[in-house]
């Protein structure tokens, strides 16, 4: 039978409290449950304690009390309680959530980027979020663009959401560059800075370290290194196709080298242990960045014994 949603002691969708206060939040449910917390609330933190107990009539319900001592502005966010996956139930895990604002007059923005702006990758025509969420829902925030320009929320293309920041539904060229969220609290002006950075889809080059046919003895290990070079503001997806792909014979490791001041270098290393005859054939490394696509392949030959 379907479980009733877990119930939180604080009702409604949001709750405002002052920084420095203690947050008490109880979750009551019909099964064992777990907490999901804002990123800045560490489960290992000494400030945080979670106590579990049996509760309800005949102790048949499951209760869990979350206590967060000396709550801070950056603990603002969603606190949710969800059932642990019940194996017999096909239903997605049921949860109850509340957004808690931890208000601090000295810190209107949850995340502050002052000296160095936070980089946000954007794509023209897509939604862009300037994530200057606030610690209290009644803070008035202005969105400014360098130099000396103000972007006005119109409730359609540009929307203000105190839990997210400014949501630009259809980002254009105009939103590329330095954007600043400003808020005045008690006569003090606070700013947090973002740099929207248009991602390109250029793939400069794709190579496999051994492009010539690869000759390998049966039982040996195959290692193929695929390298993709792109401009700095590009991200790629790298995939391999190979003869015994259906049995997931290969293990793939990925890494990115950003030490070069001109380009990003992405590596995808395919490894197959104890090569067999069924592993011979064409190995293809495919690189995709948005609509751009490049691939490179190499043939692998397997031999039973060494030859001269």
């Amino acid at each position: 039978s379907k479980l009733k949603d877990p119930e939180l002691s604080l009702k409604g969708t949001q709750h405002i409290m002052q920084a420095g206060q203690t947050l008490h939040l109880q979750c009551r449910g019909e099964a064992a449950h777990k907490w999901s917390l804002p990123e800045m609330v560490s489960k290992e933190s000494e400030r945080l304690s979670i106590t579990k107990s049996a509760c309800g009539r005949n102790g048949k319900q499951f209760c869990s009390t979350l206590t967060l001592n000396t709550a801070q502005a950056n603990h603002t966010g969603f606190y949710s309680c969800k059932y642990l996956a019940v194996p017999t139930s096909k239903k997605k895990e049921t949860e109850s959530a509340i957004y808690i604002f931890i208000s601090d007059t000295g810190r209107p923005f949850v995340e502050m980027y002052s000296e160095i702006p936070e980089i946000i990758h954007m794509t023209e025509g897509r939604e862009l979020v300037i994530p200057c969420r606030v610690t209290s829902p009644n803070i008035t925030v202005t969105l400014k663009k360098f130099p000396l320009d103000t972007l006005i929320p119109d409730g359609k293309r540009i929307i203000w959401d105190s839990r997210k920041g400014f949501i630009i539904s259809n980002a254009t060229y105009k939103e590329i560059g330095l954007l600043t969220c400003e808020a005045t609290v008690n006569g003090h002006l606070y700013k947090t800075n973002y740099l929207t950075h248009r991602q390109t889809n250029t793939i400069i080059d794709v190579q496999i370290s051994t492009p010539r046919p690869v000759k390998l003895l049966r039982g040996h290990t195959l290692v193929l290194n695929c390298t993709a070079t792109t401009p700095l503001n590009t991200r790629v997806q790298m995939t391999w196709s190979y003869p015994d792909e259906k049995n997931k014979r290969a293990s793939v490791r990925r890494r990115i080298d950003q030490s070069n001041s001109h380009a990003n270098i992405f590596y995808s290393v395919l490894t197959i242990d104890k090569m067999q005859n069924k592993d011979k054939g064409l190995y293809t490394c495919r690189v995709r960045s948005g609509p751009s696509f490049k691939s490179v392949n190499t043939s692998v030959h397997i031999y039973d014994k060494a030859f001269i």
Partner: antibody, heavy 119, light 106 residues
């Protein structure tokens, strides 16, 4: 920490042009605003122009619109400023600087390029 | 364009002494930024957004002000503080700098 490496000193004749370069390192080139500034010996600083490396968009101090032209080359991660129709008044140290924070101040400065205009 | 007037033009202070220099704007500005420049070197960012100290700037430095009147203060002068200090605004285009205050060690 960001650094800005500028090209070496230039001795040029009146009426000629010169192209100065500025190569930032230590941060993603294309996500930066770079300004060019002028300082005559023993004097204060004058802002010439800024350019956003991500798009090539630029803005100039009206005083320098006929004098300076700023560009970027993303393939070599280098910013350039071309000064034309040089006169002795253009003799100065020229700095490139990366913008900080909200863009309205200059966080990292190059070592400067001394341009001397002399017949 | 907006004019910034720095005073005094030249000043000297003994080690340990408190130092204050001012920057006056010809019309109201939102923020003032300050740079330190030593002879033969490029300027360094010293104070931004009126009162914020970038990493690496000693805590004896502070900035304050609003509207048309801003100041930079050193709580206790050190020999390494001898330099020229420039104020800068960008509340209106183009950004402008003050003529500088040269601070010498007495």
């Amino acid at each position: 920490q960001g650094q800005m490496q500028q090209s070496g000193a230039e001795l040029v004749k009146p009426g000629a042009s010169v192209k100065l370069s500025c190569k930032p390192s230590g941060f993603t080139f294309s996500s930066n605003y770079i300004s060019w500034l002028k300082q005559k010996p023993g004097q204060s600083l004058e802002w010439i122009a800024w350019i956003y490396a991500g798009t090539g968009d630029a803005s100039y101090n009206q005083k320098f619109t006929a004098k300076a032209h700023v560009t970027v080359d993303t393939s070599s991660s280098t910013a350039y400023m071309q000064l034309s129709s040089l006169t002795t008044e253009d003799s100065a140290i020229y700095y490139c600087a990366r913008h900080g924070g909200d863009g309205y101040w200059f966080a990292y400065w190059g070592q400067g390029t001394l341009v001397t205009v002399s017949a | 364009q907006l004019v910034l007037t720095q005073s005094p033009a030249i000043m000297s202070a003994s080690q340990g002494e408190k130092v204050t220099m001012t920057c006056s704007a010809s019309s109201s500005v939102s923020y003032m930024h300050w740079y330190q420049q030593k002879s033969g070197t490029s300027p360094k960012r010293w104070i931004y957004d009126t009162s914020k100290l970038p990493s690496g700037v000693p805590a004896r430095f502070s900035g304050s002000g609003s509207g048309t009147s801003y100041s930079l203060t050193i709580s206790s002068m050190e020999a390494e503080d001898a330099a020229t200090y420039y104020c800068q605004q960008w509340s209106s285009n183009p950004p402008t700098f003050g003529a500088g205050t040269k601070l010498e060690l007495k």
